[in-house]
Interface confidence: low
């Protein structure tokens, strides 16, 4: 083992290094001192470190560790933040298209119902957007409100357009009759089933991405314990006290230290793995009535079918409602002719047909594949950080926390640590409260994801969803149906080219990370990185 520096040597190299950390040299001895007051870099002989220097090294070591952790998670964090923004925006576009399709259907088939229908449709889709964002709105109430609002207009404009103004105060009665008489048949229930299932899945998908950001953000900004700070100081800086400026820590030693420092964080691993696998299950089940893109873009057709159902039963309904809502005289039913075949303005359904179009579902699968490459992120963190900080290759001629050794022995290093502080104790403390909280949140979202995921291997019986409603003849994988049932169904190849459209629709200013105005945290981080460059023990 190399001898400690002779007493007459100067501490010149240590002084010049330390000055980069702390301007001014008042804390650095000019020549080696006994160092009896040191608590971390316990000397085996004269030392070039003082207690104040040791404190500064500890602070620097913890800052370095935080920076290494942040750079380790940068790619994963960006992946989730970027996708959360893209999917949020894409879902908004789906809602906007669905609203436009529905309005076009009213305009082209039932012009006498506009503009009231536009208003009710607008309110419905606003609620859809809010629900996806996490509002506590009940989907059944949204659908009921849409049909409750539409029926009085349909009755007075289509079924009984000859009603005098004096009879138009029957609005509330008509709203009630709509449910009591099931005037739209089973269509409202069908829409409730499809919309609630698809929106629930969409909402939980976004919540899960949101939580993913929160998990990374929590572990990204962990404050490391003083014990960890001491271990890091001993690994990165104590060699300097002996004038060993070019020596690197042993790789095995680094792994032991990192596992000690990150014991709490690594506890997230089990739940993180489950999170990614549960999210994959959810994504695999997001098709047919579990795919909001498919459901919402087909609503115009189902709503059209529901109005046709009312028209077919108009004679019976007019008589019953005449009695129920106590008209002064019975009026003859007369209705303009409306074509059975659905007419859709070609401009509204103009879809770009491009080979290999990217749809939302392919983008979701792509995200899952990328996330799966981070499935071991937390268990691999200690190793990742060691590989991105200075360590000696092959564990030869390296620093083991106490001295320069030819070969690292974990047993010797552990024994050497025992009298300074117990590594096992550090691991036994359990995770930080913030880590425990994030584990609880992960457990909760994993539970939700599992409940929402469709059972494995479940095949929907031909055209029936589990409520027993016919959901349209959606056969092959390439042609996704937009439409509920009947002749009014339209097929659009590969749905919409959302991601191409995103380039046009996404307001660049609103994309996370593109904000012109720096957030307070941005300022902190940029300062922090500058600090890191100065403090870095990288040699």
């Amino acid at each position: 083992q190399p001898p400690p520096p002779p007493p007459d040597a100067t501490c010149h190299q240590v002084r010049s290094f330390f000055q980069r950390l702390q301007p001014g040299l008042k804390w650095v001895p000019e020549t080696p001192v006994p160092g009896s007051d040191l608590q971390v870099c316990l000397p085996k002989g004269p030392t070039c470190c003082s207690r104040k220097m040791e404190e500064k090294y500890q602070l620097t070591a913890r800052l370095n560790m935080e920076q290494l952790l942040q750079s380790a998670s940068m790619e994963l964090k960006f992946l989730i933040i970027q996708n959360a923004a893209v999917f949020q925006e894409a879902f908004e576009i789906v809602v906007r298209h669905a609203k436009n399709y529905t309005n076009a259907m009213f305009k082209n088939n039932y012009p006498s119902l506009t503009p009231q229908a536009f208003e009710f449709v607008g309110e419905f889709f606003t609620d859809v957007s809010l629900y996806i964002l996490g509002s506590d709105i009940n989907v059944d109430d949204m659908v009921n409100e849409l049909f409750d609002s539409l029926f009085p207009v349909i009755y007075t404009q289509l079924m009984n357009p000859g009603l005098p103004d004096s009879a138009l105060d029957i609005n509330e009665c008509l709203r009630g009759a709509r449910r009591d008489l099931k005037v739209f048949g089973n269509f409202p229930k069908l829409i409730m089933t499809q919309v609630s299932k698809s929106l629930q899945v969409t909402r939980i998908f976004l919540q899960a991405l949101n939580l993913g950001i929160e998990v990374i953000n929590t572990t990204d900004h962990l404050k490391f314990s003083k014990d960890c700070g001491r271990m890091l100081t001993r690994m990165w800086y104590c060699s300097y006290c002996q004038g060993l400026m070019m020596v690197k820590p042993c790789g095995g030693y680094c792994n032991v230290v990192m596992q000690g420092c990150m014991a709490g964080v690594v506890e997230i691993d089990k739940y993180w793995r489950e999170y990614i696998l549960s999210l994959e299950e959810l994504v695999n089940g997001m098709y047919r009535i579990y795919d909001m893109e498919n459901v919402l873009l087909g609503l115009f057709s189902t709503i059209h079918d529901s109005i046709q159902y009312v028209q077919k039963n108009a004679g019976k309904l007019t008589t019953t409602i005449g009695k129920l809502c106590a008209h002064s005289q019975q009026r003859q039913y007369r209705s303009a002719y409306y074509p059975e075949d659905l007419f859709i303005d070609k401009k509204v359904l103009k879809v770009a047909h491009v080979e290999h179009e990217e749809t939302l579902s392919s983008r979701r699968r792509e995200l899952i594949q990328k996330l799966k490459s981070f499935i071991s992120f937390y268990s691999a963190l200690p190793g990742y950080i060691c590989s991105h900080s200075p360590v000696a290759e092959n564990d030869t001629l390296c620093w083991n926390g106490q001295e320069l050794v030819e070969r690292y022995s974990q047993k010797a290093a552990r024994n050497g640590m025992k009298n300074q502080f117990n590594l096992h104790e550090l691991k036994m403390k359990g995770p930080e409260p913030v880590v425990s909280q994030i584990i609880d949140k992960l457990k909760h979202i994993n539970q939700l994801l599992r409940t929402m995921s469709m059972p494995k291997g479940r095949v929907l019986d031909k055209n029936l969803d589990e409520e027993g409603f016919e959901s349209g003849d959606c056969g092959d994988d390439e042609d996704e149906c937009i439409g509920g049932s009947g002749d009014g169904m339209i097929k659009v190849k590969n749905q919409l080219r959302f991601l191409a459209e995103l380039a046009y629709d996404l307001d660049v200013d609103d994309a996370p990370g593109n904000s012109q105005q720096a957030t307070p945290k941005d300022n902190e981080i940029s300062t922090f990185h500058n600090l890191g460059n100065v403090h870095s023990p990288l040699k």
Epitope: Q88, G134, S135, Q517, T519
Partner: nanobody
Framework: QVQLVESGGGLVQAGGSLRLSCAFS????????MAWFRQAPGKGRDFVAR????????DYADSVKGRFTVSRDNAKNTVSLQMSSLKPDDAALYYC????????????????WGQGTQVTVSS
């Protein structure tokens, strides 16, 4: 470009009340979810409360539930934070934040930030 300007901060005695306001300009306010965060000296930025685009959905940090109320006025383009039963722990720089995307408790979901307004609580 969205701009946010907070006001209403100041010195208040423990147990007292204060109302913070945030004026929003530059875009359609009703499309944005709004939130309040706070940062005490030497600490990280913590979520306080959030309100959805329509004002129907609100959410609070456990530490302020029952004492703080967040609201918005889409006609006036403002979001407010009514703070009552204030404690010394509530003293911090309060930031108003906006997002047109997902809104949650993570600061990095919010694209736009005000400069902050200082709240001091004396015991």
């Amino acid at each position: 470009q969205v701009q946010l300007v907070e006001s209403g901060g100041g010195l208040v005695q423990a147990g007292g009340s204060l109302r913070l306001s945030c004026a929003f300009s530059g875009r359609t306010f009703s499309k944005y979810a709004m939130a309040w965060f706070r940062q005490a000296p030497g600490k990280g930025r913590d979520f306080v409360a959030r309100v959805g685009p329509s004002g129907r959905t609100t959410d609070y940090a456990d530490s302020v539930k029952g004492r703080f109320t967040v609201s918005r006025d889409n006609a006036k383009n403002t979001v407010s934070l009514q703070m009552s039963s204030l404690k010394p722990d509530d003293a911090a720089l309060y930031y108003c934040a906006a997002t047109s995307g997902i809104y949650g408790e993570s600061y990095n979901l919010y694209n736009y930030w005000g400069q902050g307004t200082q709240v001091t609580v004396s015991s």
